[in-house]
């Protein structure tokens, strides 16, 4: 429905986990309008530029990693960092833009033998930054008090993506966080042009799945740019294009 | 065990003021969805209230402005104040937190409110 | 706000028996993949208990004989057996859309 495609954010999306912090930004737009408050919180507007706080990568864009704006930093002052492109440094996988993975210190294009889940679940290792608490929310390598024999099925709360099985994602829905299913091609996406726009649903959608990217579909390049509706679409190549 | 034990229900006039707690064991309360449903006598259940893990809280427009849903993780205690009561938020209220799923999947034994002159 | 039609109100069966309950929304509770339905059952006097989240997911510790299915508008509770202890009141309820809202309940008791 229009109304879930307006309130689904990409999984980097979601408001920092800041245990009850009052006033931070990232407060919850209403699904149904009239009927959900966001108790406390100010709405973050689409032209706000301010950085925006996180406390881990997932809380970025899909265009961002999360860091201390100085290396070394404090982990409390950590904000959404542009993504690194090809051939700059990096010390973990979400550093680098979509489409890429850090090896080596360098980011280098992704091949077929690296899945976004695989890259999502290995090194995430920051500046030196202690991650151990932010504001008072605990933070967890998984959930804790329960023994997770097997990881967390469709619906299951969780804190990050590798708390979810393969082909799920840990995606924002309500007031808590389940596994929802990684999108598949020509599903509708999100793609947040704006920094803006950060933490403004409640409602969110996965990252589109291997081998795809979230684009403006093409019969709606004419629509205005607030309704231009994206999907996951296989990536094209610019320097060779293959014609079947 | 995950347990949620709520209380501070009781009998107020049209237009007073009650507080709710809910006292929570068995999990990492800080990190985890709470939420108030209510049951009206001899009716079904009804949303009131939710604070999320990182604070946020929701409420629906029948109780917007009146009632204020709040947590106090150091205490592992959820709180619901509720103002300007009428005669129709008399009910059970219950706690229920969303631990291992999004739906409510652990619930409190209940606190009866009577709203009455 | 989405609306849960469940049927019948009552259902008046014996133990061993099965048990088939519906629920219908006033519009598709499926999104992100997921049906976001749940079923709750309730005794008198305590308070309602999760059996099925995700339309089609056994909560925790919740018996084989309850099963959920369905998606979009249409749901289904079956209970493959009914025990003495299933004689309660149940509840359907949806989490795709704010609020979340539940039906009105049917009622299962002894023949």
């Known amino acids: 429905t229009l109304n879930s495609v307006l309130n689904s954010n990409a999984i980097k999306n979601l408001p920092p986990p800041l245990g009850g912090a009052a006033g931070h930004p990232g407060s919850a737009v209403s699904a149904a309008p009239g009927i959900l408050y966001p108790g406390g919180n100010k709405y973050q507007t689409i032209d706000n530029y301010q950085p925006y706080p996180c406390a881990e990568d997932e809380e970025c864009g899909t265009d961002e990693y999360c860091a201390s704006p100085t290396r070394g930093g404090d982990a409390g002052v950590q904000i959404c960092l542009a993504c690194r492109k090809r051939r700059k440094r990096c010390m973990r996988h979400a550093m680098c833009c979509p489409g890429n993975y850090c090896k080596n210190g360098i980011c280098v294009s992704s091949d077929q033998n690296h899945f976004r889940g695989e890259i999502e679940e290995t090194i995430t290792e920051s500046f030196g930054n202690d991650h151990s608490t932010l504001d008072g929310y605990s933070r967890r390598t998984t959930l804790s008090s329960k023994m997770y024999h097997t990881k967390g099925q469709e619906g299951s709360v969780c804190l990050r993506s590798s708390d979810c099985a393969s082909g799920l994602c840990c995606a924002r829905h309500f007031w808590s966080k389940i596994c929802k299913p990684v999108l598949k091609e020509g599903q509708v996406c999100t793609k947040h042009r704006r920094k803006g726009s950060h933490g403004l649903e409640i409602f969110q959608r996965c990252y589109c799945g291997e081998g795809l990217s979230c684009r403006i579909q093409k019969d709606h390049h004419q629509a205005s740019n607030s309704s231009r509706l994206h999907t996951c679409q296989r990536h094209h190549h610019h320097h060779h294009h293959h014609h079947h | 065990e995950v347990q949620l034990v709520e209380s501070g229900g009781g009998l107020v006039q049209p237009g007073g003021s009650l507080r709710l707690s809910c006292a929570a064991s068995?999990?990492?309360?800080?990190?985890?969805?709470i939420s108030w449903v209510r049951q009206a006598p001899g009716k079904g259940l009804e949303w009131v209230a939710s604070v999320s893990g990182w604070g946020d809280t929701y409420y629906p427009d029948s109780v917007k402005g009146r009632f204020t849903i709040s947590r106090d993780n150091a205490k592992n205690s959820l709180y619901l104040q509720m103002n300007s009561l009428r005669a129709e938020d008399t009910a059970v209220y219950y706690c229920a937190t969303s631990y291992e799923n999004y739906a409510f999947d652990y619930w409190g034994q209940g606190t009866t409110v009577t709203v009455s002159s | 706000e989405i609306v849960l039609t469940q049927s019948p109100a009552t259902l008046s069966l014996s133990p061993g028996e099965r048990a088939t309950l519906s629920c219908r929304a006033s519009?598709?509770?499926?999104?992100?993949?997921?049906?976001?339905m749940n079923w709750y059952q309730q005794k008198p006097g305590q308070a309602p208990r999760l059996l099925i989240y995700a339309a089609s997911k056994q909560g925790s510790g919740i018996p084989a004989r309850f099963s959920g299915s369905g998606s979009g508008t249409d749901f289904t509770l079956t209970i493959s057996s009914l025990e003495p202890e299933d004689f309660a009141v149940y509840y359907c309820?949806?989490?795709?859309?704010?609020?979340?809202?539940f039906g009105g309940g049917t009622k299962v008791e002894i023949k």
């Open positions: 068995g999990f990492t309360f800080s990190s985890y969805a």
């Open positions: 519009e598709s509770v499926d999104d992100f993949g997921i049906s976001f």
């Open positions: 309820q949806q989490s795709k859309e704010v609020p979340p809202t």
